[in-house]
Amino acid sequence: SIPWNLERITPPRYRADEYQPPDGGSLVEVYLLDTSIQSDHREIEGRVMVTDFENVPEEDGTRFHRQASKCDSHGTHLAGVVSGRDAGVAKGASMRSLRVLNCQGKGTVSGTLIGLEFIRKSQLVQPVGPLVVLLPLAGGYSRVLNAACQRLARAGVVLVTAAGNFRDDACLYSPASAPEVITVGATNAQDQPVTLGTLGTNFGRCVDLFAPGEDIIGASSDCSTCFVSQSGTSQAAAHVAGIAAMMLSAEPELTLAELRQRLIHFSAKDVINEAWFPEDQRVLTPNLVAALPPSTHGAGWQLFCRTVWSAHSGPTRMATAVARCAPDEELLSCSSFSRSGKRRGERMEAQGGKLVCRAHNAFGGEGVYAIARCCLLPQANCSVHTAPPAEASMGTRVHCHQQGHVLTGCSSHWEVEDLGTHKPPVLRPRGQPNQCVGHREASIHASCCHAPGLECKVKEHGIPAPQEQVTVACEEGWTLTGCSALPGTSHVLGAYAVDNTCVVRSRDVSTTGSTSEGAVTAVAICCRSRHLAQASQELQ
Amino acid sequence: QEDEDGDYEELVLALRSEEDGLAEAPEHGTTATFHRCAKDPWRLPGTYVVVLKEETHLSQSERTARRLQAQAARRGYLTKILHVFHGLLPGFLVKMSGDLLELALKLPHVDYIEEDSSVFAQ
């Protein structure tokens, strides 16, 4: 008798005999920027403080009739999903509501900005525990709204937003496109993307994860004990705001980067049917459905990594694409991908005191993506070692020569347009795991890191015949930090990490001759941190 | 998720003006930009967020807003400062004619200006 959405986000160990996780989120304050709410609804009475903040445009239409229950509908439901007594995710969380949407559910970028500023000022006047800000709204791409979200996030606030209900690329909307915001798409009881009339959930690289967002039972503003089902990416975002409140209550010192990595780590993987998404968006859209961690204890011993895709470079000959990690994350590897296969590889380079991943388009290419592997690695000291194109026929090599540094990723970049078209493959000599190898005409970049207790190993999976996709996964307890293709094949479209699996994609096999060039090898670098494990054991 | 990704329109307008010799005029060569929502029905022309450079103080924001009002008045335009931002971003929200955008982009400390637009419950 527990609603499907609460069951879905609850780990199996909690499900017996209707048992739900303990009332969580009590140390956290969740700000809701939405419509007005019915604060005396039984679900949220005493949990939601209605602030005096209101900045909404006039309702459209001369004959618009303001009906309180309709004005309150959206916000009341979301407040209930976050913290409702019976149908809420974080039943212990307290909330504050700001009215930025009118009775028709419409607001302005400027009103939202002033609301975010109000939260920042409140935080400065009366610092409390962790803050979560839920933005269940979307407008067109807005530089200023994204900038405000970035500033608030850098002030230590966790922002969660709806991906949008436009069945479109979330990067075209704000605040969904802001990198610092946790952007949430919607799935249904069958773990499929939510369809809303002719539209549906947004998707793409700006979405961080999905969460239940169809037929979500929650507080109805029709009466003080009423419930109603609503659907949308707002409902999905409210689930993640609730999960974030639970996590932050258990571990109040979590940074935004740590929280995001944990949300990704504890999500259900590969359950969404990607066929719903446009073909060009499938690889970019995370196949993750949010869930609560299996216990409220921290998972600090784990090495957490996530994959960050860049925007598309565009088709011009010298076009590049850049993928960046969050300020608290380390870039441990860099790869690239092009649907046409025409690319000139990728390299890690310093930009503003931080490493970024840059991918290069090739002449005649339709454009490339840069793919960064972004990890939480405390006390890390990482650097990039580069070997220019080699003169010798045996190929280019580079390794981590500094004491205590381990290889976390390999990248290669070349100036010639079609590297490998008529060149034999180069094979890595066995027993040299700490080195990257590549074509003699390519420059090779090794990501070398020193961190307490960090150990890494190379894992390969080669297929002699042409395959559209070759994968290699890291085993339990190890985290994928690097993903690349062994050089030598002209038809490799690129490599990227999906959760703990390295994926190497090749051109349609029907167009490739079954020669030795058809051989594809996926190379994964798998790491773990003994230091983090020890620190966790000492805490417990 | 970078700024340059968005499917929005950017209009770059020249900064130098013979008509207004401004004190604190921006350094030569810097360009303030104008942004507006790519989805036309969601645009709200007539209200603009003027974003100032990162280290601008509240007093400078207020001074810049007043300067815009004064220069607009000299051209016969009414403007209304709806809000002065500080705490997150330095800047101000102004209700004015779009005819004044070129003038506003030339003000000292201006980083960019964005036309207001609608957001919707999802």
């Epitope: 209707e18 019976d86 029709d222 009466c223 | -």
Partner: antibody, heavy 126, light 106 residues
Framework: QLQLQESGPGLVKPSETLSLTCTVS??????????WTWIRQPPGKGLEWIGS???????YYNPSLKSRVTISVDTSKNQFSLKLSSVTAADTAVYYC??????????????????WGQGTLVTVSS | EIVLTQSPATLSLSPGERATLSCRAS??????LAWYQQKPGQAPRLLIY???NRATGIPARFSGSGSGTDFTLTISSLEPEDFAVYYC????????FGGGTKVEIK
């Protein structure tokens, strides 16, 4: 079939605390589908809702009585209790306990008070 | 709070007659109104919920109608066991009850 039974002292002195317990039989108080409610009826007068509690111990009180009311639940004993502090003669009434469907699971039944206990008269007098 | 006013306070009718009881709310309660029957020395019993739905085991002679602020409970043909006090109750905003209508034998 679910039954509710109120118990507690029938006489309480003014300024003291009234304490009543409702024992639920024929069903579990630990179900997430229900709220457990106290309602009172002064002699010859109408009904007044006092407050409700769910199996997690989350409470919801009548605003006019909130400062004096405490409702608690003991799922191990299948009981819930009412405490009303600083009583006066105006608190003399028949006190009923009742079940209310929370509304989260529509299949659990209508979102109203049903069934009720038979009621217990509490007189406030010195 | 929402005040419910019941009328008449007392209704004197004979068995077999039709009874019409009224409940008026001080503001709209939509359809979130119920009717209860209470016999002397007994607890109230739910008859009608959400303005017009009969509760389990309630005879078809009981019917409810109305929405917003005006509601009616109709007993099409009074049986001897129907003589009792009837209360309306709303849940639009918290929970409040009407003052009751006593249906007595004429």
């Amino acid at each position: 079939q679910l039954q509710l039974q109120e118990s507690g002292p029938g006489l309480v002195k003014p300024s003291e605390t009234l304490s009543l317990t409702c024992t639920v039989s024929g069903g579990s108080i630990g179900s997430s589908s229900y709220y457990w409610t106290w309602i009172r009826q002064p002699p010859g007068k109408g009904l007044e809702w006092i407050g409700s509690i769910n199996y997690r111990g989350s409470t919801y009180y009548n605003p006019s009585l909130k400062s004096r009311v405490t409702i608690s639940v003991d799922t191990s004993k299948n009981q819930f209790s009412l405490k009303l502090s600083s009583v006066t003669a105006a608190d003399t009434a028949v006190y009923y306990c009742a079940r209310e469907n929370s509304g989260v699971v529509p299949a659990a039944g209508p979102n109203w008070f049903d069934p009720w206990g038979q009621g217990t008269l509490v007189t406030v007098s010195s | 709070e929402i005040v419910l006013t019941q009328s008449p306070a007392t209704l004197s009718l004979s068995p077999g007659e039709r009874a019409t009881l009224s409940c008026r709310a001080s503001q709209s309660v939509s359809s979130y109104l119920a009717w209860y029957q209470q016999k002397p020395g007994q607890a109230p019993r739910l008859l009608i919920y959400d303005a017009s739905n009969r509760a389990t085991g309630i005879p078809a002679r009981f019917s409810g109608s109305g929405s917003g602020t005006d509601f009616t409970l109709t007993i099409s043909s009074l049986e001897p066991e129907d003589f009792a006090v009837y209360y309306c109750q709303q849940r639009r905003n918290w929970f409040t009850f009407g003052g009751g209508t006593k249906v007595e034998i004429k």
